[in-house]
C-alpha cells in the first residue's frame, strides 16, 4: 500500500482506567494529513463515535477506559497529499494494585513511573496526563502509600507534586489521581510511581538530561523504516551541541555514502524554565549490521544509546 | 506549603525607580521554575511584567523591557523588581507569582504602589 | 503580541444559572489557555490550566472547553461564592498576555 512503517517504543498501562494516545511524528503531522487508527492490521478503522469505549479523537486513540482484551500493536497510518506512514505502538495492559503490597514489582515500567528525588534539595515529582482536550482533568489529588499527601512540605503545582528539604523518608509508593471526565461520564486515572532518593546534585546548571533514549534495546525487523527520537532537557541559556554518534563518529558522516542512516533536523519547545530539545535518527531501512551497535545520543557531556535487535521468533 | 510576600514602599516619585522584592518560602527559586512580576493597574486588568528563571535567566514584557530589572538573591530566596523612570501610568498592584510549566499557579497577596508627587 | 479578547465583560446572573465565558487569541495557542479568577482586594486564583485541567480545589461545576484560537468558561451552577471578575491567559508566546476580564455579578 505505499505507507513507510515506523516503530514506536512499547507502552506498558493499567487496566480498568482511561488511556489515550496521540499520533504526531512531527516531521510528518505538521502539514495538512488525515490520521487514521486501526488495530492489529484490522482493515476497519477504529471507530469515531465519541460514545465508543475505544475511539478516535482528532489524532488521538482514547480508550475509556483501558481493558484487559485491548493489549496489542495498534496502527495509525498518516497520510498526506505526497506521504504515506504507519505507525506501530505496541500497547500491553497490566492489571494494577497499586496499595496492594502482595503484587510483586510492575513489569518494565516506563520512566514516567519511576522518578527521582534528590536528598537534601527542594525537587518536584510529575503526574504524566496524557488525554485530548475533549477530556476534562480534575484536580490532582497525591498519594504516598495509599494515604493522600499533606503536609507543609508538599505543594500541587499543576501537574506536579513540589518537595522542599527531600528526605530519605520520601523514597516509596506514590500515585497522582485525577478524575477525567468525558461526554457526562467521570472515570478515575491513577498513575503509580516507584520514587527513589539519590544524594547526586540533580538537574540544573549546564548539565544536559536526556529524556529518551534509557541505554536500552529496541526489537526491530529487519528491512523496516525506524525513525528514533532523542529528547534533552536543557538550560535555555545553554551551548550543548546534540547529535546521534555510531563508532564515535556523526551519524551523517558514517553513513555519508549510503546516506541510509540520517540525523534529523533538531527541534525543541521552550518551558519557561528550560527547553526540551528533539533530535531523531531515521533508519531509512534497517539492515542485519544495525543489530547490536550502539547508536549514541549525545547532548554535551550526557550521552544515552539505542541498541537494535531482532524481534524474537514467534513459533506460534 | 509554597508563600509569597511582597514589600517595597507604597509610594514613589515620578521619574524615580520603585523598587520592590518578593519573599518565597516552601520552595528554593533555584530548583526550578519561572518566578515573575505582574501588576495591575486600580479598576484595570493584568499584565505580565517579566521573570527571573531558577536558572537566573530572564525576560521582559516587550512593552517596559527599557525600564525593567528583575534580579535575585538566593540566600535569602528572594526576587526583585526594579522600574525606572515611572509615572503615574504605573501606578498598580504589583504581584509576584510563580509560572509552572503552563500557568501562574500561586501568587502573592499583592503590593500597591502609587506614583505621585 | 497575542492579543485576547473576552467576552462578555460583564454579565448579571441568578443563583443557579449557567454562564459561559469566552475568550478568542488572536493567533494559535495550542492549546496553553488558562482562566483566572480575582475577587475584589485580593490577588487572582488559578482556577483551570493547559485549556481542560481543574487547578487543587477547583470544583466541577467550573467546566473548560477549547483549541485552536478559541476558549469558553463555563460554570454550570452559579452559586454567590462565584461572584468575582474572570480573566483568561495565554501561556503560548511571550509575553504572556491576559483578556481584559469577565464581571460576574447575582441579579
Known amino acids: 500500500d505505499g505507507c513507510k512503517d515506523i516503530f514506536m517504543k512499547n507502552e506498558i498501562l493499567s487496566a480498568s482506567q482511561p488511556f489515550a494516545f496521540n499520533c504526531t511524528f512531527p516531521p510528518i503531522t505538521s502539514g495538512e494529513v488525515s490520521v487514521t487508527w486501526y488495530k492489529n492490521s484490522s482493515k476497519i478503522p477504529v471507530s469515531k463515535i465519541i460514545q465508543s469505549r475505544i475511539h478516535q479523537d482528532e489524532t488521538w486513540i482514547l480508550f475509556l477506559p483501558m481493558e484487559w482484551g485491548d493489549s496489542g500493536v495498534y496502527q495509525c497510518v498518516i497520510k498526506g497529499r505526497d506521504s504515506c506512514h504507519r505507525i506501530h505502538v505496541n500497547l500491553t495492559v497490566f492489571e494494577k494494585h497499586w496499595c496492594d503490597t502482595s503484587i510483586g514489582g510492575l513489569p518494565n515500567l516506563s520512566d514516567e513511573y519511576k522518578q527521582i528525588l534528590h536528598l537534601g534539595k527542594d525537587d518536584s515529582l510529575t503526574c504524566h496526563l496524557h488525554f485530548p482536550k475533549s477530556c476534562v482533568l480534575g484536580p490532582i489529588k497525591w498519594y504516598k502509600d495509599c494515604n493522600e499527601i499533606k503536609g507543609e512540605r508538599f505543594t500541587v503545582l499543576e501537574t506536579r507534586l513540589l518537595v522542599s528539604n527531600v528526605s530519605a523518608e520520601d523514597r516509596g509508593n506514590y500515585a497522582c489521581q485525577a478524575i477525567l471526565t468525558h461526554s457526562g461520564k467521570q472515570y478515575e486515572v491513577l498513575n503509580g510511581i516507584t520514587v527513589s532518593i539519590t544524594e547526586r546534585a540533580g538537574y540544573g546548571g549546564s548539565v544536559p538530561k536526556i529524556i529518551y533514549p534509557k541505554n536500552h534495546s529496541i526489537e526491530v525487523q529487519l528491512g523496516t523504516t525506524l525513525i528514533v527520537d532523542c529528547n534533552v532537557t536543557d538550560t535555555k541559556d545553554n551551548t550543548n551541541l546534540r547529535c546521534w554518534r555510531v563508532n564515535n563518529t556523526l551519524v551523517d558522516d558514517y553513513y555519508d555514502e549510503s546516506k541510509r542512516i540520517r540525523e534529523g533536523v533538531e527541534t525543541h519547545v521552550s518551558f519557561r524554565e528550560h527547553n526540551l530539545y528533539t533530535v531523531n535518527i531515521t533508519f531509512l531501512e534497517v539492515k542485519m549490521e544495525d543489530y547490536g551497535l550502539p547508536f549514541m545520543c549525545h547532548a554535551g557531556v550526557s550521552t544515552a544509546y539505542i541498541i537494535l535487535q531482532l524481534p524474537a521468533p514467534d513459533f506460534r | 506549603d509554597l508563600q509569597f510576600q511582597e514589600s517595597g514602599p507604597g509610594l514613589v516619585k515620578p521619574s524615580q525607580t520603585l523598587s520592590l522584592t518578593c519573599t518565597v518560602t516552601g520552595y528554593s527559586i533555584t530548583a526550578d521554575f519561572a518566578w515573575n512580576w505582574i501588576r495591575q493597574p486600580p479598576g484595570k486588568g493584568l499584565e505580565w511584567i517579566g521573570y527571573?528563571?531558577?536558572?537566573?535567566?530572564?525576560n521582559y514584557n516587550p512593552s517596559l523591557k527599557s525600564r525593567v530589572t528583575i534580579t535575585r538573591d538566593t540566600s535569602k530566596n528572594q526576587f526583585s523588581l526594579k522600574l525606572s523612570s515611572v509615572t503615574a501610568a504605573d501606578t498598580a498592584v504589583y504581584f509576584c507569582?510563580?509560572?509552572?510549566?503552563?500557568?501562574?499557579?500561586?501568587w502573592g497577596q499583592g503590593t500597591l504602589v502609587t506614583v505621585s508627587s | 503580541d497575542i492579543q485576547m479578547t473576552q467576552s462578555p465583560s460583564s454579565l448579571s446572573a441568578s443563583v443557579g444559572d449557567r454562564v459561559t465565558i469566552t475568550c478568542r487569541a488572536s493567533?494559535?495557542?495550542?492549546?496553553?489557555l488558562n482562566w483566572y479568577q480575582q475577587k475584589p482586594g485580593k490577588a487572582p486564583k488559578l482556577l483551570i490550566y493547559y485549556t481542560s485541567m481543574l487547578h487543587s480545589g477547583v470544583p466541577s461545576r467550573f467546566s473548560p472547553s477549547g483549541s485552536g484560537n478559541d476558549y469558553t468558561f463555563t460554570i454550570s451552577s452559579l452559586q454567590p461564592e462565584d461572584i468575582a471578575t474572570y480573566y483568561c491567559q495565554q501561556g503560548h508566546t511571550l509575553p504572556w498576555t491576559f483578556g481584559g476580564g469577565t464581571k460576574v455579578e447575582i441579579k
Open positions: 527571573i528563571s531558577y536558572s537566573g535567566d530572564t
Open positions: 493567533q494559535w495557542i495550542n492549546n496553553y
Open positions: 507569582a510563580i509560572r509552572g510549566p503552563y500557568s501562574f499557579t500561586y
